[in-house]
């Protein structure tokens, strides 16, 4: 029998996807895992093994279908089940009743690009990836910028509370090397949370004209 | 709804071998459990070899431990069944099976199935 505190942690990108995390103090690295879901209302179920990623968590991602393929609704209660082999037999070692749309974490935003850059300033756009149209506009989005000398955790958060995207970064140095990165959320869910930072776009600011002010 | 087509069967003399290959399309391949499963002549279909979405996980049935393997390429959509030292009794069709859900995989009603592939050993 495995004992010690367990965390059974999953969220929904709003699509096809349910990404699953399960924490277990003193669980064996070489136990065969899956976590099982069972919607109330869907005729399917769906499985995924759950992969060490580290000394004793383990996650899995259920993958519900097409990438951009609505199957869950805001009405759907899902049973999410570990279970783990032991021996011949299965064990249930968490069990949740998981409401879809309360738990969301979106994926990460995509097609960061430049859409103008001068000496002091930049306007940035970038694409929202696998979500649901049910949001319609109620998605907020945190941004931030590196720069040269500092550390992403200590770099300030633009919130742009509202679907917006794109932003126009000021006061910026001429002739800098900078990085950008985004997140997003929707307004929806009770234990909804931010989605990963997107890759970082790395862009310079143009030097500033010869013999001008700056 | 997803499809499943077997290749590599054929004749083979005892102690043999044979890869069979399913190739899985119109749907997302890493969402299913797959499984081989075989039915030799006047027999039930019977379990062979299964592999997990991730494929960190096999099993097989007692009688082809340590002969077969099984084994998936998720950027291929294809499962694959390597098998050794092949004896007689290892004729049958060879079916390949996809379930979304790893606890139902070994239930016949429950999958969805490719048309078979023949493998033949000979004496």
């Known amino acids: 029998a495995v004992n010690g505190t367990s965390q059974f942690t999953c969220f929904y990108n709003s699509r096809a996807n349910i990404s699953c995390v399960w924490s277990q103090d003193g669980a064996l690295q070489d136990t065969s895992c899956q976590v099982h879901a069972w919607p109330d209302r869907r005729r399917w179920n769906q499985t995924c093994e759950l992969l060490p990623v580290s000394q004793a968590s383990w996650a899995c991602n259920l993958i519900l279908g097409a990438p951009d393929s609505q199957k869950l609704t805001t009405v759907d209660i899902v049973t999410l089940r570990v279970l783990c082999r032991e021996g011949v037999r299965w064990r249930v070692m968490a069990i949740q009743d998981f409401k879809p749309f309360e738990n969301l974490r979106l994926m990460a935003p995509i097609s960061l690009q430049v859409v103008h850059v001068e000496t002091h300033r930049c306007n940035i756009s970038w694409e929202i990836s696998q979500a649901s149209h049910y949001f319609e506009r109620h998605l907020e989005f945190e941004a931030r910028t590196l720069s040269p000398g500092h550390t992403w955790e200590e770099a300030p958060l633009l919130t742009l509370k509202q679907k917006q995207e794109w932003i126009c970064l000021e006061t910026l140095t001429p002739d800098t090397q900078y990085e950008f990165q985004v997140r997003v959320k929707p307004l929806q869910g009770e234990f909804t949370t931010w989605s990963p930072w997107s890759q970082p776009l790395a862009f310079r600011t143009k030097p500033a004209a010869l013999g001008k002010d700056t | 709804e997803v499809q499943l087509v077997e290749s590599g069967g054929g004749l083979v003399q005892a102690g043999g071998s044979l890869r069979l290959s399913c190739t899985v399309s119109?749907?997302?391949?890493?969402?299913?459990?797959m499984a081989w499963f075989r039915q030799a002549p006047g027999k039930e279909r019977e379990f062979v070899a299964t592999?997990?979405?991730?494929?960190?996980?096999?099993e097989y049935v007692d009688s082809v431990k340590g002969r077969f393997t099984v084994s998936r390429d998720n950027a291929k959509n294809t499962v694959y069944l390597q098998m050794n030292n092949l004896k007689p009794e290892d004729t049958a069709v060879y079916y390949c099976?996809?379930?979304?859900?790893?606890?139902?995989?070994?239930?016949?009603?429950?999958?969805?199935w490719g048309q078979g592939t023949q493998v033949t050993v000979s004496s």
């Open positions: 099976a996809a379930n979304t859900d790893y606890f139902r995989i070994r239930s016949l009603d429950a999958n969805t």
């Open positions: 119109g749907d997302v391949f890493v969402r299913y459990t």
């Open positions: 592999v997990t979405d991730s494929g960190r996980t096999t």
